[in-house]
Interface confidence: low
């Protein structure tokens, strides 16, 4: 068992691709891909299904085309894209990525998503590898991106085939007595022919050094694309030792049904348009083999062939291939400003201060039927209700005789006496104001705000 | 319930045009690929054109035997299918159908005739 | 282009009996196989999609089965209506090709 992982690093025009957007008539839309994964190297069962796995990546952020300007590498989904494999994996394998664009404005009679690029590649990759690096043409896009595969424990091994048991793992038979704890029994890889590259190559057999696809030489140094000769074909040129320019793959346009054709070494790639795939193109329509059905619907054939499969989808996601995911919170089912969130497999609110409920319908907070005792009455306000108590009442819901001389209010041994619309500091000789809070100089004049005409220092003040 | 119906056939003589019309009710024409079929007692059933959707920008295909002279063409506001010939030829003798692309719906068929 | 051959040309059935027809397809074409039944004086009537699919409303005795390169239709217990020419069709590739036509006569 184990996980491929492939990380897109760009999307945009190639070089010499489309000056500007051939979707720049349109509104607002965002990119996210598809990544499928087919064992072995064979060219046929174009049609068969993604049997190492599939993938969907998230929507990456809007983005809003300027209908006259270049079309820019476009926003990219964050993250990566992992295709978990439960078997061994093959070594040998097609990988196909396809670049689908949501569209975002009003979608009238039509699908809102479309398909962009669509490149397939076929490959060697042995398990536990460092990255590989890739760049695809497909028509006038070019796509940047590194895959690799890695095992999870327990398999090890190029192929993910080998069980690694730990050290502490005995072996005794049952009713025998614990074994002594077993050596480490996960395989040491095997050392690579001396100088062999890191980064580039691996083995399997000790002594070997075998190199991932685009390097070569004996220690996979040399980078396939570096070779002066590359991408010639025809016979060799006394001068250089060269190749001089041949017939091409794409020369007569393999592709059919109107797919545009690419070079890729000693070999062409047709990039299909809607509705095509294949090698060539050549398989017109959409089965369930094709794995139409995004989001994990579910692909069942259709009983009219012109819709030759339906998409059962799973909750929060819609359209003919799932790929729409359900704006369940453009409803509004949060009450009383609460925050919605669609977790997908459900709607939650997320509830402001003072509410409550699975839609905030709650008012915690409400004044209705919450009586205040003692005279109080209720006040809403800032998220909360609360009582106003009446004089020599407290707690939430004034039930509480307050004594307001227990907080010991005067200061400077100012003495407190309850009183029936408050509370009255006797100041001692030398303070004044309303908690004996300030010192009287010997002149009688206070050090702070002037005392109100009528009291003199040393006279009762009366705290509201 | 599903109708096609062809209109349009007749006899042609060699070199002449003809233009076959097909209405549809039933299902959302906007939303099929649509195709003509002919068949012969000589060559049997023979495909001959498709059309695809307005999202497709009216993409066409043609059989390589009329490539040129026949021009298949959809008014999606009146539900309508269009075969244009041109330099018919007696080969080019049958019945012609309206089908959905896959050729679940069929319509009963035109006759054309091309003989001096 | 894909050629469909279709064997036999004719057949001649008793009400009850079962029959297959076969339909083989010069290269792969996955499963994109239709199977047609044309009554005379109609039009053709789709039967079988996808090499195995039955179409909405028809009888549960016509089965389909095949892929790649050799599919048959069969007819678990003929029946007086089912008289007609069988067609079959791919849709793999342009241009869509259809067999000669397998001719079903009732004894």
């Known amino acids: 068992a184990g996980v491929f992982e492939l990380q897109i690093h760009s999307f945009g025009p190639g070089p010499g691709g489309a000056p500007r957007s051939p979707y720049s008539a349109r509104g607002p839309c965002r990119l996210f891909f598809r990544v499928c994964l087919k064992p072995g190297l064979s060219e046929e069962a174009a049609e068969s299904p993604c049997a190492l796995g599939a993938a969907l990546s998230a929507r990456g952020p809007v983005y809003t085309e300027q209908p006259e300007a270049p079309a820019p590498d476009l926003p990219l989904p964050n993250g990566l894209l992992q295709v978990p494999f439960r078997d061994a994996w093959p070594g040998t394998f097609s990988l196909i990525i396809e670049t689908w664009r949501e569209e975002l404005g009003d979608q009238i009679g039509g699908p809102a998503w479309s398909l962009l690029a669509r490149v397939t590649r076929r490959r060697r990759l042995a398990a536990g590898g460092p990255w590989a690096g890739d760049i695809q043409r497909a028509g006038a896009w070019e796509l940047r991106f590194s895959y690799r595969a890695r095992c999870e424990l327990p398999a090890v091994g190029t192929a993910c085939t080998r069980l690694c048991r730990p050290r502490s793992a005995s072996r005794c038979g049952p009713g025998l007595r614990p074994c002594a704890p077993l050596e480490d029994e996960c395989e040491a890889p095997p050392v690579c022919r001396a100088g062999c590259s890191l980064e580039h190559g691996f083995c399997e057999q000790p002594g070997e050094c075998r190199c991932l696809e685009g390097w070569t030489g004996p220690l996979c140094m040399v980078p396939v694309s570096t070779s002066s000769c590359l991408g010639l074909r025809g016979p060799s040129s006394t001068t250089t030792g060269c190749l001089v320019p041949g017939p091409g793959p794409c020369d007569g346009n393999p592709c059919a049904n109107g797919g545009s054709c690419s070079e890729t070494p000693g070999s062409f790639e047709c990039t299909c348009p809607r509705g095509f795939y294949g090698l060539r193109c050549e398989v017109s329509g959409v089965t369930c083999a094709d794995g139409p059905c995004f989001n994990g619907g579910l692909c069942v054939g259709g009983a009219d062939p012109d819709s030759a499969y339906i998409c059962h989808c799973p909750p929060g996601f819609q359209g003919s291939n799932c790929e729409k995911r359900v704006d369940r919170c453009s409803l509004q089912p949060c009450r009383n400003g609460g925050l919605c969130l669609d977790l997908g497999h459900a709607l939650r609110c997320r509830c402001r201060a003072g509410f409550a409920g699975p839609r905030c319908e709650h008012d915690l907070n409400d004044c209705a039927g919450r009586a205040c005792a003692n005279g109080g009455t209720c006040v809403e306000g800032g998220g909360a209700h609360r009582c106003s108590c009446a004089l020599g009442f407290g707690g939430r819901d004034c039930r509480e005789r307050a004594d307001p001389c227990a907080a010991r209010p005067c200061a400077h041994g100012g003495r407190c006496y309850a009183h029936f619309s408050g509370l009255v500091c006797a100041c001692a000789p030398g303070y004044m104001g309303a908690r004996c809070e300030f010192p009287v100089h010997p002149d009688g004049v206070s050090a702070l705000p002037a005392a109100p005409p009528g009291l003199r220092p040393g006279d009762p003040q009366r705290y509201p | 319930e599903v109708n096609l119906e062809e209109s349009g056939g007749g006899l042609v003589q060699p070199g002449g045009s003809m233009k076959l019309s097909c209405v549809v009710s039933?299902?959302?024409?906007?939303?099929?690929?649509m195709s003509w079929v002919r068949q012969s007692p000589e060559k049997g059933l023979e495909w001959v054109a498709e059309?695809?959707?307005?999202?497709?920008?009216?993409?066409?295909h043609y059989a390589e035997s009329v490539k040129g002279k026949f021009t298949i063409s959809r008014d999606d506001s009146k539900s309508r299918l269009y075969l244009q010939m041109n330099s018919l030829r007696p080969e080019d003798t049958g019945i012609y159908y309206c089908?959905?692309?896959?050729?679940?719906?069929w319509g009963q068929g035109t006759l054309v005739t091309v003989s001096a | 282009n894909i050629v469909m051959t279709q064997s036999p040309k004719s057949v001649s059935m008793s009400v009850g009996e079962r029959v297959t027809l076969s339909c083989k397809a010069s290269?792969?074409?996955?499963?994109?196989v239709y199977w047609y039944q044309q009554k005379p004086e109609q039009s053709p009537k789709m039967m079988i999609y996808?090499?195995?699919n039955r179409y909405t409303g028809v009888p549960d005795r016509f089965t389909g089965s095949g892929s790649a390169t050799d599919f048959t239709l069969t007819i678990r217990s003929v029946q007086a209506e089912d008289l007609a020419d069988y067609h079959c069709?791919?849709?793999?590739?342009?241009?869509?090709?259809f067999g000669s036509g397998t001719k079903l006569e009732i004894k």
């Open positions: 089908t959905s692309n896959r050729f679940a719906y």
């Open positions: 039933g299902f959302t024409f906007s939303n099929y690929w």
């Open positions: 059309i695809r959707l307005k999202s497709d920008n009216y993409a066409t």
């Open positions: 290269e792969n074409v996955g499963t994109y």
């Open positions: 996808g090499a195995s």
């Open positions: 069709g791919q849709s793999y590739s342009y241009p869509f090709t």
